[in-house]
């Protein structure tokens, strides 16, 4: 069960995944953009769930990539209320939580579109949730790219 809150999504600025000042950091859009920007190399490995990082990346580049991703994942805790914060979790598990949260948001959005009452009190839709289908697909693809035995832990 996961859902996003908040107002209009703002693209993350730069590899640090820092969101622009003054903007709410609750939209699922930022989560996906952040993951996408930091996982460009990983998302290229669509050759199968067991595929590793492309050989064209040397060890230093991989380290930089993983460092940036760690920063991104720590930011996710502020955006995704389903992420456990009191225990260590693997990146694979984090991605699964993000996917699950977006799924909850989508379920809520779909229910609201049928009844016309977001949140149950005639509330306006506050986030660009209609784009979640594509974002879920992107997240799923990225999750499949991360090796199943990836046990790099994020605090």
């Amino acid at each position: 069960m996961k859902v996003a809150s908040g107002s209009t999504a703002t693209a993350a600025a730069g590899p640090s995944c820092a969101l622009k000042a003054g903007k709410t950091a609750s939209g699922a859009g930022e989560v996906v953009r952040c993951l996408s920007e930091q996982s460009v190399a990983i998302s290229r490995c669509a050759g199968g769930a067991g595929a590793r990082l492309p050989a064209l990346l040397d060890e230093q580049q991989v380290n930089v990539l993983l460092y940036d991703m760690n920063g991104c994942y720590s930011r996710l805790k502020e955006l995704v209320p389903t992420l456990p914060q009191n225990r260590k979790v693997s990146k694979v598990e984090i991605l699964q939580h993000v996917i699950d949260y977006i799924r909850d948001l989508q379920l809520e959005l779909n229910s609201e579109s049928e009844v016309g009452t977001p949140g149950g009190r005639g509330l306006p839709v506050r986030a660009p949730l209609s784009t979640l289908n594509g974002e879920i697909s992107a997240l799923t693809a990225e999750a499949a790219c991360v090796p199943a035995d990836d046990r790099i832990l994020c605090r």
């Epitope: 069960m1 996961k2 859902v3 996003a4 809150s5 908040g6 609750s26 805790k77 502020e78 995704v80 209320p81 389903t82 992420l83 456990p84 914060q85 009191n86 939580h97 949260y101 799924r103 909850d104 948001l105 379920l107 809520e108 779909n110 229910s111 049928e114 009844v115 009452t117 977001p118 949140g119 149950g120 009190r121 506050r126 986030a127 949730l129």
Partner: antibody, heavy 116, light 109 residues
């Protein structure tokens, strides 16, 4: 809307099942929680059921309280080994992922009185 | 389970005044906190979620702030209708924490 039913006067030790009936949405689209409030006291979280049907309980409620989905629009709260301390109004509430899982829609509550 | 400590238990203020309610979590819940208002004989009403985001339809006189373990609900320009009991609640779904604070009764004179 959300509505609770099944509250009544029972003797200590008697099991009791409360039902939460929702309309206008499906239980598979929103997380649903149970909260209780003893007379003149504060709110006490009991447990929650996720959209996938997984259940999570407050530590004190584990083992004695069970949340289960009985249809797309009804869920039960089964309570066993009731004591006078369980006397309270029991609320069913709908969570919203878009509100960071806060409870946005509450039923009016159903009163459970445990007395000998 | 996490423990949510709410203070004060009761507070009295005049119409037009300001009331501040504090909520302390026994461990960090980042921004996963909600505030509710409850009047006698009624179920609670959501005021603020994600620690500081105002629920639609709630007057901007209500303001939530804080993160980690320390949170605050401030009600300014008090109106008679604000007289109620206010509760904080952890909404940490990731760790299955949904504990409520003990509540604060606000009396408006």
């Amino acid at each position: 809307s959300v509505e609770e039913s099944g509250g009544r006067l029972v003797s200590p030790g008697t099991p009791l099942t409360l039902t939460c009936t929702v309309s206008g949405f499906s239980l598979s689209s929103f997380p649903m929680g149970w909260v209780r409030q003893a007379p003149g006291k504060g709110l006490e979280y009991i447990g929650i059921m996720s959209t996938s049907g997984s259940t999570y309980y407050a530590d004190w409620a584990k083992g004695r309280f069970t949340i289960s989905k009985t249809s797309s629009t009804t869920m039960d709260l089964k309570m066993t080994s009731l004591t006078t301390e369980d006397t309270a109004t029991y609320f069913c509430a709908r969570g919203a992922a878009s509100r960071f899982y806060a409870f946005t829609l509450w039923g009016p509550g159903t009163l459970v009185t445990v007395s000998s | 389970d996490i423990v949510m400590t709410q203070t004060p238990a009761s507070v009295e203020a005049a119409v037009g005044g300001t009331v501040t309610i504090k909520c302390q979590a026994s461990e960090s819940i980042i921004n996963r906190l909600a505030w509710y208002q409850q009047k006698p004989g009624q179920p609670p009403k959501l005021l603020i979620y994600r620690a500081s985001t105002l629920e639609s339809g709630v007057p901007s006189r209500f303001k939530g702030s804080g993160s980690g373990t320390e949170f605050t609900l401030t009600i300014s320009d008090l109106e008679c209708d604000d007289g109620a009991t206010y509760y904080c609640q952890a909404t940490d779904y990731g760790d299955s924490y949904f504990t409520f604070g003990g509540g604060t009764e606000v009396v408006v004179k």
